[in-house]
């Protein structure tokens, strides 16, 4: 999916006003600086490029973080101020609801919504570029 | 200290697909970063190709996206280019290295491919 | 495409001398740049990260400056291992990340 023609200044205001506090939720407990934010991105389409792969694909060690407030929120944000984001999405819900049916909180997963935060961070920078 | 290693075959002819590997010691390319790769025309300067991140995320230069994949093995901590249809301007030194998908902070010692007959 | 241009192409100096080479964007990228260092048969490698941060065990006597669409890389005090080809890369400018034509510092 091509993120260009987002509305960027709607999923920011979500991202501040909910998204970030289930962030902070989900890592609670844990010190901000356990994990070292090994990617970054360049631009808010970018930015959210890499915050639906990360947030949606399962990794080693972390299955999913799909069923998780955030990332339920994150998926919202998209399909309301992404055009053509919730058609694009259908075969990949499907994926999600087979790979997990409960949630495992892993250092794994934390580390993870650890990089997840510093993405959103840098979606959220005054001067990053629009595309 | 994360080490990586490009190779494959110095000599490709036009039309084919060059294919190269890069096998990474020292860091789980499934742990963190993305895992690039760039190219060096002789004695001229730097293009990047694309990335695959720890997570799976793929990008690709525009100019270049319609010939590239780039894909992973996990098992053997190591990532993959393919270029297809190659010409001669396609000869150069091939680099792999780790990204925060933004610079490039460990490289490879490049290994160079000709496309000729 | 951002394209960079640095200068100069060529900058010829003496052990000891300062190298101030520039590289300039066809469009603001904020502080979104890097500068490389290549030697002869060898890899890049990285120095200067956000336009003016030094990446892990790059020495002093380098550092970066700039924003928007002019940048500086300075060598404070050449040493001989110094003398090399340089690039800037900006990553403003995603998926089309460009890299300059290069500047070559060498010996006089």
């Known amino acids: 999916y091509d993120f260009t023609n987002c509305d960027f200044e709607k999923i920011k205001a979500a991202y501040l006003s909910t998204i970030s506090k289930d962030l902070i939720t989900y890592m609670s407990g844990t010190k901000s600086t356990e994990f070292n934010n090994t990617v970054s991105c360049s631009n808010r389409p970018h930015c959210l490029t890499e915050i639906q792969s990360l947030t949606f694909n399962p990794t080693a060690g972390c299955a999913s973080l799909a069923k998780e407030m955030f990332a339920m929120k994150t998926k919202a944000a998209l399909a309301i101020w992404c055009p053509g984001y919730s058609e694009t999405q259908i075969n990949a819900t499907q994926a999600m609801k087979k790979a997990r049916k409960s949630k495992v909180t892993t250092n794994k997963c934390l580390e993870q919504v650890s990089q997840l935060q510093g993405l959103w961070r840098r979606f959220n920078r005054p001067l990053l570029k629009q595309q | 200290q994360v080490q990586l290693q490009e190779s494959g075959p110095g000599l490709v002819k036009p039309s084919e697909t060059l294919s190269l590997t890069c096998t990474v010691s020292?860091?789980?390319?499934?742990?963190?970063?993305?895992w690039s790769w760039i190219r060096q025309p002789p004695g001229k300067g730097l293009e990047w190709i694309g990335y695959?991140?720890?997570?799976?995320?793929?990008s690709y230069n525009p100019s270049l996206k319609s010939r590239v994949t780039i894909s992973r093995d996990t098992s053997k901590n190591q990532f993959s280019l393919k270029l297809s249809s190659v010409t001669a301007a396609d000869t150069a030194v091939y680099y792999c290295?780790?990204?925060?998908?933004?610079?490039?902070?460990?490289w490879g010692q490049g290994t160079l491919v000709t496309v000729s007959s | 495409e951002i394209v960079l241009t640095q200068s100069p192409a060529t900058l010829s100096l003496s052990p000891g001398e300062r190298a101030t080479l520039s590289c300039r964007a066809s469009q603001s990228v904020s502080n979104n740049l890097a500068w490389y260092q290549q030697k002869p048969g060898q890899a890049p490698r990285l120095l200067i990260y956000d336009a003016s941060s030094r990446a892990t065990g790059i020495p002093a006597r380098f550092s970066g400056s700039g924003s928007g669409t002019d940048f500086t890389l300075t060598i404070s005090s050449l040493e001989p291992e110094d003398f090399a080809v340089y690039y800037c890369q900006q990553y403003s400018d995603w998926p089309q990340y460009t890299f300059g034509q290069g500047t070559k510092v060498e010996i006089k």
């Open positions: 020292g860091y789980s390319i499934s742990s963190g970063y993305g």
């Open positions: 290295a780790r990204t925060n998908l933004l610079y490039f902070d460990s």
């Open positions: 695959i991140s720890y997570y799976g995320s793929i």
